[in-house]
């Protein structure tokens, strides 16, 4: 009933709880002297389904047959309407539509840990939409039985609160769950099991790792387990990997040696346990242990390259460059690099430890035969040294690679191609392709990049440290024993017209001609490799087309003579620069009047 129903009653037949698809009869009856005051014929009883009118009747009672009610609860309210007054609520009823419970399926019981309690889960089947009570029953040896009830609306789990012990691990227990509601009942199939079947060990805890003599090859994993555990699964992986290595061990007694770990690598370790070879289930995985393996001495050898620069008649500057070892080769934190410089004939040697850099520059005499050795050191030792003899890399003209070209290859890549040298191509032991940003001053601080290419290759794709709209000086070296030949070219991955023209800084007169000097365009405004400069001139105040002179771009050139100007005529001069993409805007304008005689 919805309220006190003082004025009348609502009755529901056959029941307030009905099977889906059934019909109910709802009767609303007024109690004596509870109708409209003046004339009972004007009593109008109205039946509402929720907030919608579904039937009415003039008189003291209303009968309504209702069909097609949906699953769940439907509220019916009966009201009285009298002339010239608000409707009065008489009474109401809720009707519950549902189904009998289906047979519970997949009943499964588990005891978490040797000290845990038995809990069971099952699948209820489709929702009954009615209050349904579940009773779980467990029977064991010696006619022992336990029972637990559950009155939650969605009940699919119950914990008996009892602990099975390993005294008789082969004893059988049987569980059954029964669902009951107003429309029927149904029981699951019985589930029979032993202690070993249902006890799921707690995950291992207190996991530790030890490296004997700080060596990765002598590594033992330790953990603690419940007493009856027979089997363990170990899984481990480098922290940056998604794939696990898996190991199964029997009777490990809380320790296992791992033999295939990589040095100086952070690993994640987890362990799981099981009580019996083929009965029961694995525990959850333990919490992860994260640990870094110890360092080992580096393997591999450094990739070393060098550059020579003439200083004066007796001295030369040597700049050595090397690449970091890969993580798998470094096998630890590289603390320093050891560079040894030796004059081969005199035997003089100089050793230096370099930290924080992968380059070293020194000045040596131009005479003598020099060699260098470079190795990388971590806390455990050093890599094998890379030894190279210092030679004139471009001395052997016959070893110079031919027809070197550099073409843009997609975003921030340059494809360098060449032809083998004229001299016996089979003499080439390797090619080295070197590139660095082009700086007009020939700045030695500009980072050097290089890659090595096998002797049968005639192309290389360079992509490391390549930026758009920057011009690179690219050299291809052919190395053969203690000889080398080289060819160079300029290249860029992406270009457009320069943003500005050269700035004329001086015009001087020399024997009837003029010499124009200019400042280079700043590198960030060149927008790629410059191909030409153009010098334009025309008579001041003239509307005629300017004359021009086009000069091929050379890195070091910043002046050029012009000898076709008339004396005592004032000219306006300016310059532009060109890349393969087009011409820059004008640089500054300068006026000049040649004083001397015409040629």
């Amino acid at each position: 009933k919805i309220d006190a129903c003082k004025r009348g009653d609502v009755t529901v037949k056959p029941s307030h709880v009905i099977l889906l698809g059934s019909t109910v009869n709802i009767t609303c009856s007024l109690k004596p002297r509870q109708g409209c005051f003046h004339y009972s014929r004007r009593n109008k009883l109205i039946l509402y389904k929720f907030d919608r009118r579904i039937n009415f009747h003039h008189g003291h009672s209303l009968n309504s047959q209702v069909t097609g009610l949906p699953l769940g609860t439907t509220l019916f309210v009966c009201k009285l309407a009298c002339i010239n007054s608000d409707e009065i609520q008489i009474c109401g009823a809720e009707i519950f539509v549902g189904v009998a419970p289906e047979q519970p399926q997949n009943l499964s019981c588990i005891q978490k840990g040797e000290q845990g309690t038995v809990a069971c889960t099952w699948e209820r089947g489709r929702d009954t939409h009615l209050y349904t009570e579940y009773t779980l029953q467990l029977s064991g040896p010696k006619n022992l039985t336990w029972q637990k009830q559950c009155k939650d609306i969605y009940c699919d789990y119950l914990d008996f609160g009892i602990n099975l012990t390993p005294e008789s691990p082969e004893s059988n227990f049987t569980a059954k769950v029964t669902a009951v509601n107003s429309l029927g009942s149904s029981s699951s199939l019985p589930s029979t099991f032993t202690f070993l079947d249902i006890v799921r060990p707690l995950p291992p805890w207190d996991i530790r790792i030890k490296f004997q003599k700080a060596s990765v090859s002598r590594c033992t994993l330790y953990w603690r387990d419940e007493g009856l555990v027979l089997l363990n699964r170990l899984r481990y992986r480098p922290s940056n990997s998604r794939l696990w290595n898996m190991v199964n061990v029997t009777k490990a007694k809380g320790r296992h040696d791992l033999l295939d770990l990589k040095p100086f690598t952070e690993y994640e370790f987890q362990i799981s346990s099981k009580l019996h070879l083929y009965k029961g289930s694995w525990s959850d995985w333990s919490e992860s242990l994260r640990a870094q393996t110890p360092e080992e001495e580096p393997t591999g050898m450094l990739d070393v390259w060098y550059m020579k620069r003439h200083i004066d008649y007796s001295r030369q500057q040597i700049s050595l460059f090397w690449k970091n070892l890969s993580v798998s080769e470094a096998r630890g934190k590289i603390l320093h690099y050891q560079v040894t410089l030796q004059e081969l004939t005199g035997g003089k040697a100089m050793t230096q430890n370099i930290t924080g850099h992968t380059s070293w520059t020194t000045v040596i005499p131009r005479t003598g035969n020099w060699a260098v050795a470079v190795s990388a050191a971590n806390s455990k030792g050093s890599s094998l040294p890379t030894r190279i003899n210092i030679m004139n890399l471009c001395e052997a003209g016959l070893l110079a690679p031919r027809q070197v070209s550099a073409n843009s290859e997609g975003m921030d890549n340059i494809l360098v191609t060449w032809q083998p040298p004229r001299k016996d191509p089979s003499a080439v032991q390797e090619y080295v392709v070197e590139w660095r940003e082009l700086h007009p001053g020939g700045d030695t601080q500009v980072p050097l990049n290089w890659l090595r290419s096998r002797p049968y290759n005639v192309s290389a794709l360079i992509s490391e440290n390549i930026k758009s709209y920057i011009c690179y000086e690219i050299r291809v070296y052919a190395l053969s024993g203690d000889q080398g030949g080289c060819s160079s070219i300029l290249g860029n991955s992406k270009h457009k017209a320069p943003l500005s023209g050269p700035h004329i800084n001086a015009i001087t007169e020399e024997k009837g001609s003029i010499l124009i000097s200019w400042n280079s365009i700043p590198v960030q405004e060149q927008m790629g490799c410059l191909l030409h400069y153009r010098i334009y001139w025309k008579e001041r105040d003239s509307n005629s087309q300017p004359q021009l002179c086009e000069i091929p771009y050379r890195v070091s050139q910043n002046s050029h003579p012009i000898n076709s100007l008339q004396p005592r005529v004032t000219y306006v001069l300016w310059m532009t620069a060109l890349t393969a993409a087009g011409e820059s805007s004008h640089g500054n304008e300068r006026e000049f009047c040649l004083q001397g005689k015409a040629n």
Epitope: T23, K44, I46, K49, D51, R52, R53, I54, N55, F56, H57, H58, G59, L62, N63, S64, Q65, V66, T67, G68
Partner: nanobody
Framework: QVQLQESGGGLVQPGGSLRLTCVAS????????MSWVRQPPGKGREWISA????????DYADSVMGRFTISRDNAKNTVYLQMNSLKSEDTAVYYC????????????????WGQGTQVTVSS
């Protein structure tokens, strides 16, 4: 699904009579109260009459009281509206509907209305 088919409309002179018929299908007719509704041209719909599921109680809007009579035949799944003393203001499209979708209390749902039948009262 619920289907309601109205018929019997037409052109009639003021003071004349018409009988509208509504045949229902797709639901248990005898357990549902039914209504007649009309929609004059250019105006909103207006509930005019209802009959309960047993056919023993009826209700009318004041505008048609004494002139219109609603009745039903549960054996034929049919509801009728006898209209007498018709006036020009009775001109409208007439629909039948389940009472739960349209009553004197609430006529907002068009879930189970029929297609309607046109009644025109004109001299």
């Amino acid at each position: 699904q619920v289907q309601l088919q109205e018929s019997g409309g037409g052109l009639v002179q003021p003071g004349g009579s018409l009988r509208l018929t509504c045949v229902a299908s797709g639901f248990p007719f005898s357990t549902h109260a039914m209504s007649w509704v009309r929609q004059p041209p250019g105006k909103g719909r207006e509930w005019i009459s209802a009959i309960n599921s047993g056919g023993d109680s009826t209700d009318y809007a004041d505008s048609v009281m004494g002139r219109f009579t609603i009745s039903r035949d549960n054996a034929k799944n049919t509801v009728y509206l006898q209209m007498n003393s018709l006036k020009s203001e009775d001109t409208a499209v007439y629909y039948c509907a389940k009472y739960e979708d349209c009553s004197d209390y609430d006529c907002s749902s068009r879930a189970s209305w029929g297609q309607g039948t046109q009644v025109t009262v004109s001299s």
